[in-house]
């Protein structure tokens, strides 16, 4: 066992001589991003105060390529890197094409309306005028490609002109535009060369030891890894913690059960019911508030102040009133819950599917004409699954070196 342990320790650390170094650097596991849109069926009726009705469309599947660059080994047992992602549409795996049209809430208009709710009426009437002049409406009919990667909108230029630096988009607005061909921030993680117990744990993100998006030290902490590998020798008592730049927070997954993936023993980690619970149900989450119903997390503080919410798809594990407020939602544990299957000895993921939903809080705001008589509602925009499974040569090498060899050495 000590020999096996030595073999594992030697091969999991972030070091060019390590067996898993290239796997860490390039991630040979094919990742796929599957996006499901909520097509709004009754936009005119919603403006009149009726209940929203949506139809799930998709999946629209993209192959996700990841590579680390600017890899710099520091002298405090850490390594810094930028990880870039690019996405390539996969027509054969998709149910539809990127030119499919989807009716969606106009995030810029309805988001701005909620943000302006407590501002002076004159300012809200200016907004009405501006939206009118620019031809902006509460709902828009855009292609999948436009929603994902960006569409030209005069409002983007207007926001950038009058509120410089507030908005991460330059001339196009797209929900995934920031992710394509760009990095997710500078991660500095422990290599495990000197101290294996800290391997993969994040030391800093963008030079920060903690973020300032939230209202408590606990919620602002950068805990766990960067979400790709974890320290070895896990037990059922272990938790899977990682910092997600997209959610602007650390997340903790819990052990659920043991399993086997392609002959490799795994531990399945899943989201606890408390992940997106509000502060009144789970006090440690109070720092993420102000909260609406439980089961959705307000990410406005790190998403240009827009009233955007993160949750499980179809409001799974959330307050039932959320799913009941929108016709066409059907939360389902099997289809909508996330999981990561980890090889406990090495802390390397074998098979995973991280599923999250993005929603917009919208309502009628007095004086912003475009909001009509919309009843307050958290309306799902889309949900996505980021999935990957080890396969082929990588799987064979992994199985041989880290499962078969230790077994042989054991005997």
């Amino acid at each position: 066992p000590s020999l096996i342990k030595q073999q594992v320790l030697k091969n999991v650390r972030i070091d060019p001589s390590s067996l898993s170094f290239n796997m860490w650097k390039e991630i040979p596991i094919p990742f796929y991003l599957s996006v499901y849109f909520f097509d709004v069926m009754n936009p005119s009726e919603i403006l009149k105060g009726e209940k929203p009705q949506v139809r799930e469309r998709g999946p629209y599947v993209y192959r996700e390529f990841r590579h680390k660059s600017n890899i710099t080994f520091n002298n405090n047992d850490t390594v810094s890197f930028l990880e870039y992602r690019t996405f390539q549409f996969q027509p054969s795996k998709s149910h539809g094409s990127e030119s499919d049209y989807i009716v969606m809430p106009n995030i810029l208009v309805l988001g701005a309306a909620v943000m302006m709710e407590n501002k002076p009426m004159t300012l809200k009437l200016i907004m009405t005028l501006a939206f009118t002049t620019l031809g902006e409406r509460a709902f828009m009919n855009r292609t999948v490609g436009e929603i994902m990667w960006g569409y030209k909108d005069p409002l983007v230029n207007l926001i950038n002109k009058y509120f410089p630096g507030m908005f991460p988009f330059k001339d196009k607005f797209g929900l995934f535009a920031e992710l394509n061909n760009s990095d997710s921030g500078l991660f500095t993680v422990f290599t495990g060369v000197q101290n294996i117990s800290r391997i993969h744990l994040v030391d800093k993100w963008n030079g920060l030891s903690k973020v300032d998006f939230w209202h408590s030290d606990q919620c602002n902490m950068i805990n766990g890894t960067s979400g790709q590998m974890w320290p070895p020798f896990m037990t059922p008592e272990s938790s899977l913690e990682f910092y997600s730049p997209e959610a602007c927070r650390s997340m903790k997954l819990m052990y659920k059960e043991s399993g086997v993936f392609e002959g490799i023993p795994t531990y399945r980690f899943v989201a606890p019911k408390t992940l997106f619970a509000n502060g009144s149900i789970y006090p440690p989450n109070e720092g993420f508030c102000p909260c609406l119903e439980s089961g959705i997390q307000n990410v406005s503080t790190c998403r240009f102040s827009a009233p955007l919410f993160l949750s499980h798809p179809h409001f799974l594990n959330a307050d039932p009133v959320l799913a009941e407020a929108v016709t066409g939602l059907h939360p389902n544990q099997e289809a909508h819950s996330l999981f990561l299957d980890i090889h406990p000895v090495t802390g390397i993921p074998m098979n995973c599917s991280v599923k999250l939903q993005l929603s917009l809080y919208m309502k009628s705001v007095a004086g912003i004409g475009q909001t009509g008589k919309i009843e307050p509602v958290v309306l799902p925009l889309l949900w996505f699954a980021e999935s990957g499974a080890m396969e082929g040569e990588t799987l064979h090498t992994f199985y041989t070196q880290l499962v078969l060899m230790p077994k042989v050495m054991h005997y």
């Epitope: 403006l47 002076p120 009426m121 200016i126 009405t128 009118t132 475009q370 909001t371 009509g372």
Partner: antibody
């Protein structure tokens, strides 16, 4: 030329609901440049803005009357309406409907450029 | 009780110049454009001046408006008998969150 015409009962009993309609002709109520407003004038007194409504149904009201006022739009009839509940004698007035213009650039100039002739509503038992 | 104060009356002989003042505060005239309405006896009000000094088409250039600080004024030059009416100033009030009218000034042509 835009014209507005108020219609509704001239007499309303105390504690009941005052209901008025305003029909717009010579222009579409669905024009996105305008709200449509109601203003009243008690006999021998000054003008008081009640509230305004957009073609989408979006409203904003005078806070002093907000709890009792409801305004709505019927784009198919090119009409907008006013409901004022729990009326008292103090609500006796000539009620005008008017086109509420939002003009100007970053300084919004709100103004009422076209007015109906007005209808006298008396609150009395 | 109106927050925009006007003199109750003003008068002049035909051909004279009459000025009506409208006094407000920083939350109305001080921060928003002023409009003026003319109400002839027994008729609905009519927009006379908007955005402090702009005349809608059809309004004679005898009518002019100005604004300074928290006060505004309407001037009628070359007074005519047909100018006999009630005049109201108006502006949005940021504190009250309402469109407010002045107390009204009755102009009499002597």
């Amino acid at each position: 030329q835009v014209q507005l015409q108020e219609s509704g009962p001239g007499l309303v009993k105390p504690s009941e609901t005052l209901s008025l309609n305003c029909t717009v002709s010579g222009g579409s109520i669905s024009s996105s440049s305008y709200y449509w407003g109601w203003i009243r004038q008690p006999p021998g007194k000054g003008l008081e803005w009640i509230g305004s409504v957009y073609y989408t149904g979006n409203t904003y009201y005078n806070p002093s009357l907000k709890s009792r006022v409801t305004m709505s739009v019927d784009t198919s009839k090119n009409q907008f309406s006013l409901k004022l509940n729990s009326v008292t004698a103090a609500d006796t007035a000539v009620y005008y409907c008017a086109r509420h213009v939002l003009g100007g650039g970053w300084e919004v100039s709100q103004r009422f450029d076209y007015w109906g002739r007005g209808t006298l509503v008396t609150v009395s038992s | 009780q109106s927050v925009l104060t006007q003199p109750p009356s003003a008068s002049g002989t035909p051909g004279q110049r009459v000025t009506i003042s409208c006094s407000g505060s920083s939350s109305n005239i001080g921060s928003n454009p002023v409009n003026w309405y003319q109400q002839l006896p027994g008729t609905a009000p009519k927009l006379l001046i908007h955005t402090n000094n702009q005349r809608p088409s059809g309004v004679p250039d005898r009518f002019s408006g100005s604004k300074s600080g928290t006060s505004a004024s309407l001037a009628i030059s070359g007074l005519l008998s047909e100018d006999e009416a009630d005049y109201y100033c108006a502006a949005w009030d940021d504190s009250l969150n309402a469109y407010v009218f002045g107390t009204g000034t009755k102009v009499t042509v002597l």
